[in-house]
């Protein structure tokens, strides 16, 4: 299949990935679908270096990432292993807090104003970051 060798216009290249930073807010599921329609996924943070890069671009603003526990265990949207992977939770987070009064707990992860992570109600309209890998083969079948 074809390969993406450079980032689309409006996207930022970093370490062989392309990132797009929203400037408005959506619920987590809408942000997830948004990235999928761009052949991307909500950002998956795999290192402290990537954390710093994303944090630099989003500033002190609540921003969704591609991490959720809507089906039980915490999972990254691209299948990256959560248990062995990089984590940057705020102290005492995630806490699946029910006291917000919105029904249910907190199943979606976001960057907080200091960059550390918190779990929150997935319906909150936060900004989001899409990520796609360079040199990733597209999902089209090869031409025969």
């Amino acid at each position: 299949g074809s390969e993406r060798t450079c980032c689309p216009v409006n996207w930022v290249e970093h370490e062989r990935s392309c990132y797009w930073f929203s400037r408005s807010g959506k619920a987590w599921a809408d942000a997830d679908n948004y990235c999928r329609l761009e052949d991307a996924h909500l950002v998956v943070v795999t290192s402290w270096e990537e954390q710093k890069f994303v944090q630099h671009h989003i500033g002190p603003v609540n921003t969704w990432m591609g991490l959720h526990d809507q089906n039980g265990p915490w999972k990254w949207v691209d299948g990256t292993d959560y248990e062995t992977g990089f984590k940057n939770w705020r102290p005492e987070q995630p806490d699946d807090w029910y006291g917000h009064g919105l029904g249910g707990g907190e199943d979606c992860a976001h960057f907080t104003d200091d960059g550390r992570w918190n779990d929150d109600v997935c319906q909150r309209p936060y900004r989001w970051v899409c990520e796609t890998e360079l040199d990733k083969a597209s999902q089209e079948p090869p031409l025969l």
Partner: antibody, heavy 123, light 109 residues
Framework: EVKLLESGGGLVQPGGSLRLSCAAS????????MSWVRQAPGKGLEWVSV????????FYADSVKGRFTISRDNSKNTLYLQMSSLRAGDTAVYFC????????????????WGQGTMVTVSS | DIQMTQSPSSLFASVGDRVTITCRAS??????LNWYQQKPGRAPKLLIY???SLQSGVPSRFSGSGSGTDFTLTINSLQPEDFATYYC???????????FGRGTKLEIK
């Protein structure tokens, strides 16, 4: 000139199948999500399906899920809609439309439309 | 799902009039609202995006306003070519199922 041209519409019996095509020109086709939107006679616009630029992500309206399949051939700059188990309620003009998001455009919108192709489901 | 309610469903006006069409969302959509114009037998055409931004080539007599749940499309000094059906569309939900209003048909009085 940026252009979309649908074809493949016609009269089909209930339960039958039909494949619509949409030929794109004037823009880099594989950079954009593409969609089908339909309009029943005298009615409003109803979104049917959308897929990403590579074709890797697809989404459907509940009313067509399991019956319609959206696909694309980026080497031919063509979008398709395979329709099966057709019902009278599927009778409509089917438009293909480019979906441009704010990750690429100044907006999130259907910004380029074809002229439409009529699908009539009747015995 | 977010429901979009347009009013009125039809509107009679004369050339030179100022007309307003409203669109209400069942929950807040911030400014994620587009307006389209459709003439009989033709494809819809994007007029306004993000509530108030005019698409390239659209005359300045068209304007949009609103935020949250209530939005308006205003046409100042109606021209003969403006008689058409107008649809609002929310894009807060990325998947646009039920995202269009039912339309407002603007007809000559």
């Amino acid at each position: 000139e940026v252009k979309l041209l649908e074809s493949g519409g016609g009269l089909v019996q209930p339960g039958g199948s039909l494949r619509l095509s949409c030929a794109a020109s004037g823009f880099t086709f594989n950079n954009y999500a593409m969609s089908w939107v339909r309009q029943a006679p005298g009615k409003g616009l109803e979104w049917v399906s959308v897929l990403s630029g590579s074709g890797g992500s697809t989404f459907y309206a509940d009313s067509v899920k399991g019956r319609f399949t959206i696909s694309r051939d980026n080497s031919k700059n063509t979008l398709y809609l395979q329709m099966s188990s057709l019902r009278a309620g599927d009778t409509a003009v089917y438009f293909c439309a480019r979906y441009c998001s704010s990750a690429r455009c100044p907006y999130d919108a259907f910004d380029i439309w074809g002229q439409g192709t009529m699908v009539t489901v009747s015995s | 799902d977010i429901q979009m309610t347009q009013s009125p469903s039809s509107l009679f006006a004369s050339v030179g009039d100022r007309v307003t069409i409203t669109c209400r969302a069942s929950q807040s959509i911030s400014d994620y609202l587009n307006w389209y114009q459709q003439k009989p037998g033709r494809a819809p055409k994007l007029l306004i995006y993000d509530t108030s931004s005019l698409q390239s080539g659209v005359p300045s007599r068209f304007s949009g306003s609103g935020s949250g749940t209530d939005f308006t499309l205003t046409i100042n000094s109606l021209q003969p070519e403006d008689f058409a059906t107008y649809y609002c569309q929310q894009t807060y939900n990325i998947l646009p199922e039920r995202s269009f209003g039912r339309g407002t048909k603007l007809e000559i009085k």
